[in-house]
């Protein structure tokens, strides 16, 4: 009896894993063994598929070959017992098209109200990935354990924290890889759960602000409680995408080292041209907080964030606020070509109860004044990137008289 | 394969000085921080402190501070411990170790057993 | 400094049993905390580090567990090379510090 030539035959690729699958033709026939030929794009002559030779179930593994990836191949499949079938040719391919990336390794830290997630690629050293390593981006699904309620975190680098979580609670999360230059999307790695400690004694500072005052950097955080001593690093941010770093060495800001107020200055020099993170930690001399979230700060964006400088036209029962770009000296404008959003504090001139107006306009109403009383006002520009949380000085503040009654109009 | 080999036992005279030794291998050393502890003979293991060798960037226990210095020298992947004032108490083993972040103590080196006595 | 204390301080045990060995931090120190184990005359050897990942090469009848100030160490069966002293060591603040060390021993 002619044998017959296996059918459907898929072709897998997992990073540096090559496996092939394929339907026997004839289930009645027993003993039946399957081989491979291979052929490279340009040559006449069909070469063995080492790992790929008299295999006796539907599947086998060609990773030992050393192929270049970027090549397109063909290969060729026949049944044999005492006879051989015809060849059947699978259509030929390129090892990086059809390959997709594998499940990436995870290692989970926790502390009380955050998780780190280090990120590395599954295969060490992958040839498919060699010259693509240092692009790949991640994304992952976080969740609850209790609830399921997913939130999802797309384009984060190889170590990521995720903040505001709850003490003493697990949190599953699942991540995979990618690679937006070729759009390739990964496999999802395992479910990974980790449980949040017991709720630190010393919360980490918040609100960290970096402002420029003459020729030195002003560094601001908020704290709860008070006799404590904080330390502040500083990393540049490019690390955190170089995906074989494990280990971030984040550097000590000398002159805000032991600091026991919650506020430090440095100097401008200190800091060279570049995007850094900072975060900073408390401690009361027995007990460290966890550090603080980190802030990205770019020495171009505020060097140059200045206060924004505005005029007031006065009403009965409002202030009309026009914002115009800050003066630099000599009194010529700066132009930023990135988006601000401004932060308007105002109060009555006799009163030191402010009140706030957030705006991403240029011209903004200060409603509900009272009539021929003098408020104050001052202003300061944000940058509107989260992550990047710039914000200049205030600008001085400018203080005027509201009209009489009727003149809202 | 990541080795990290430390220099032969010495023995010192009170009040003298001694550097150990502990050349990297299998690795860059500039990508990681070197540890160093002490172990007294029967006794448990005691953190001395630890350098950046990329830039010199050091941290001691204030135990150690003054009396311990840590130095590296890149060009042959070693770093170094020095040890001022030796006491009779200070006959002990020195290991350094290999921190990788999370991944913490990950290599030590087969130690270094210093002698002091007069 | 944070201060870590591990019981027991000696364990007298036999070949299969499970074993658990605990330490406490002084202060929280989320999951920075790795476990050594040493025996006489050589260099400590890493089983476990960030409280629950094995070092590759560790067998997996060692586990680590925990978060905050209190972790253990299991041997799930102790072997015979399994005789030696424990360590668990925290890194998340410095001075980094050790526990005092379990010592195990044959029954």
């Known amino acids: 009896k002619n044998l017959k030539s296996p059918q459907k035959v898929e072709v897998d690729i997992i990073d540096d894993n090559f496996i092939l699958r394929w339907n026997r033709s004839d289930e009645s026939v027993g003993n039946v063994t399957f081989s491979f030929d291979y052929q490279k794009t340009g040559m006449d002559n069909w070469i063995k598929l080492s790992g790929c030779q008299n295999i006796t179930s539907t599947k086998c593994n060609f990773s030992s070959l050393k192929l270049n990836v970027y090549e397109e191949i063909k290969l060729r499949i026949r049944a044999e017992k005492e006879n051989t079938s015809s060849w059947y040719e699978v259509d030929s391919f390129t090892p990086f098209r059809k390959a997709q990336i594998g499940p990436p390794e995870v290692h989970l830290e926790a502390e009380d109200k955050a998780i780190v997630i280090h990120i590395s690629p599954g295969t060490k050293d992958s040839v498919m990935w060699a010259l693509d390593g240092l692009s790949f981006t991640y994304s992952l699904v976080i969740w609850k354990n209790s609830s399921g309620v997913e939130e999802r975190i797309e384009n984060i680098y190889s170590r990521h924290k995720i903040y505001k979580l709850s003490p003493e609670t697990t949190y599953c999360l699942k991540v995979k890889a990618a690679l937006l230059t070729s759009w390739k999307i990964g496999v999802y790695s395992p479910v990974h759960c980790i449980k949040t400690t017991v709720e630190n004694e010393l919360p980490p500072p918040e609100n960290i602000e970096v402002s420029v005052q003459n020729q030195n950097y002003v560094l601001k955080w908020d704290y709860t409680y008070a006799n404590m001593t904080f330390q502040v690093q500083w990393l540049h941010a490019f690390l955190k995408r170089n995906p074989g770093n494990h280990l971030y060495k984040w550097k000590q800001i000398p002159d805000c080292e032991n600091v026991k107020t919650t506020q430090c200055v440095f100097p401008q020099n200190v800091f060279q041209k570049g995007i850094y993170l900072l975060r900073v930690q408390a401690s009361d001399g027995n007990n460290t907080s966890f550090w603080s979230e980190e802030i990205k700060f770019d020495t171009e964006i505020q060097a140059f964030l200045l206060p924004p400088v505005f005029n007031i036209r006065s009403l009965s029962d409002s202030f009309h606020i026009y914002i115009g770009a800050p003066k630099q000296s000599g009194n010529t404008p700066v132009i930023q070509d990135y988006p601000l959003i401004y932060e308007i504090i105002f109060w009555e001139n006799t009163s030191n109860a402010e009140r706030k107006i957030i705006e991403k306009k240029t011209d903004v109403t200060v409603p509900n004044l009272k009539p021929l009383t003098v408020y104050c006002v001052k202003a300061r520009a944000h940058t509107m990137d989260e992550k990047l949380n710039k914000s200049s000085v205030f600008s001085d503040a400018v203080c005027e008289k509201t009209k009489p009654g009727n003149t809202s109009k | 394969q990541v080795q990290l080999v430390q220099s032969g036992a010495e023995v010192k005279k009170p009040g003298a000085s001694v550097k150990l030794s502990c050349k990297g291998s299998?690795?860059?050393?500039?990508?990681?921080?070197i540890h160093w502890v002490k172990q007294a003979p029967g006794q448990g293991l005691e953190w001395i402190g630890r350098i950046d060798p990329e830039d010199a960037e050091t941290k001691y226990a204030p135990k150690f501070q003054g009396r311990a210095t840590i130095t590296a020298d890149t060009s042959i992947s070693t770093a170094y411990l020095e040890l001022s004032r030796l006491r009779s108490d200070d006959t002990v083993v020195y290991y350094c170790g290999r921190y990788h972040g999370y991944w913490a103590l990950d290599y030590w080196g087969q130690g270094t057993l210093v002698t002091v006595s007069s | 400094d944070i201060q870590m204390t591990q019981s027991p301080s000696s364990l007298s045990t036999s070949v299969g049993d499970r074993v658990t060995i605990t330490c406490k931090t002084s202060q929280n120190v989320g999951t920075n905390v790795a476990w050594y184990q040493q025996k006489p005359g050589k260099a400590p050897k890493p089983l476990i580090y960030?409280?629950?990942y094995r070092y590759s090469g560790v067998p997996s009848r060692f586990s680590g567990s925990g978060s905050g100030t209190d972790f253990t160490l299991t041997i799930s069966s102790v072997q015979p090379e399994d005789f030696a002293t424990y360590y668990c060591?925290?890194?998340?603040?410095?001075?980094?510090?050790f526990g005092p060390g379990t010592k195990l021993d044959i029954k």
């Open positions: 299998g690795f860059n050393i500039k990508d990681y921080y």
């Open positions: 060591h925290q890194y998340f603040s410095y001075p980094y510090t």
């Open positions: 960030s409280t629950s």
